[in-house]
């Protein structure tokens, strides 16, 4: 396979990585598709240095990034461990709210107006971040 | 000046098989998602597949799903359709389309179309 | 899936009519919906993207409006090479479905 050396068009490189930032929005699963057909994956965060990265480019606004619970425990996109990694949410967050009146709990995590985390329906449609990163094989699959 | 030319298309019988291929020009092929679109005779457009640039990541309709498969050669710049187990309702102008702005699917350029027709 | 229906399913128009067409969305498209241009035997021309915003040498003429789950594409002035079926699509959720088109007939 190839590899990324520069970033696309329109993306933000930073620290080996590179980002795109949505303006409007769309459910956590169409970002998700969204942003895989961009061989990429919703923003994994894994530090507070990256933290402060996307909340200078996001600004105040609900963003989605790549981790969720939708089936069980909290899981990152890209396969970074949850447990030991970083985390940033607001304080008792993440509640896995019912009272929404949507149905069902908060599967899906986002970066709130000051950048801390909460969890939200899954379906809000919200803004997203793209990451992919840099010098990464490409997982293009031979053809028949 | 952007150009996809689709090929491959033709009759076939019921149960069988037929690869379509788009060759692309004008672009930086691999940087960008592509898409097979059809449309059977008298009905309006079915988006039918999609692919990463990079062939990482594909998507199907569940009309077509474990029967069609989607690849690229980004060497060759060239869009692959693989239709395995055609079907009668598989007859349809099938268009290849360039995404226009990232994932979103928007499709800002299109090819002419390859007909296929699955016929005993 | 998102279901498009389109409205009317045929128009018949004069060079120089207004012309409107309706999308209705079965959900909400967060302004995910784009319009086509079909003419037999050429390849489909992307007119509108983003529910408003007009393709790079698409004539003026052509615009788009709507929000929620409701659009509509407007030719201002129809002019002979505008004779053609018009298809919007949303882009918003995978499937991408279209409506099944708006056929612009000489009146």
């Known amino acids: 396979g190839s590899e990324r050396t520069c970033c696309p068009v329109n993306w933000v490189e930073h620290e080996r990585s590179c980002y795109w930032f949505s303006r409007s929005g769309k459910a956590w699963a169409d970002a998700d598709n969204y942003c895989r057909l961009e061989d990429a994956h919703l923003v994994v965060v894994t530090s507070w240095e990256e933290q402060k990265f996307v909340q200078h480019h996001i600004g105040p606004v609900n963003t989605w990034m790549g981790l969720h619970d939708q089936n069980g425990p909290w899981k990152w996109v890209d396969g970074t461990d949850y447990e030991t990694g970083f985390k940033n949410w607001r304080p008792e967050q993440p509640d896995d709210w019912y009272g929404h009146g949507l149905g069902g709990g908060e599967d899906c995590a986002h970066f709130t107006d000051d950048g801390r985390w909460n969890d939200d329906v899954c379906q809000r449609p919200y803004r997203w971040v793209c990451e992919t990163e840099l010098d990464k094989a490409s997982q293009e699959p031979p053809l028949l | 000046e952007v150009q996809l030319l689709e090929s491959g298309g033709g009759l076939v019988q019921p149960g069988g098989s037929l690869r379509l291929s788009c060759a692309a020009s004008?672009?930086?092929?691999?940087?960008?998602?592509m898409s097979w679109v059809r449309q059977a005779p008298g009905k309006g457009l079915e988006w039918v597949s999609a692919i990463s640039g990079r062939g990482g990541n594909t998507y199907y309709a569940d009309s077509v799903k474990g029967r069609f498969t989607i690849s690229r050669d980004n060497s060759k710049n060239t869009l692959y359709l693989q239709m395995n187990s055609l079907r009668a309702e598989d007859t349809a102008v099938y268009y290849c389309a360039k995404d226009g702005f990232g994932g979103s699917s928007y499709f800002d350029y299109w090819g002419q179309g390859t007909l296929v027709t699955v016929s005993s | 899936d998102i279901q498009m229906t389109q409205s009317p399913s045929s128009v018949s128009a004069s060079v120089g009519d207004r012309v409107t067409i309706t999308c209705r969305a079965s959900?909400?498209?967060n302004n995910w919906l784009a319009w086509y241009q079909l003419k037999p035997g050429k390849a489909p021309k992307l007119l509108i993207y983003a529910v408003s915003s007009l393709q790079s040498g698409v004539p003026s003429r052509f615009s788009g409006s709507g929000s929620g789950s409701e659009f509509t594409l407007t030719i201002s002035s129809l002019q002979p090479e505008d004779f053609a079926t018009y298809h919007c699509?949303?882009?918003?959720?995978?499937?991408?479905?279209f409506g099944q088109g708006t056929k612009v007939e000489i009146k």
């Open positions: 699509q949303q882009a918003n959720s995978l499937p991408w479905t």
């Open positions: 004008g672009f930086t092929f691999s940087s960008y998602a």
């Open positions: 959900q909400g498209l």
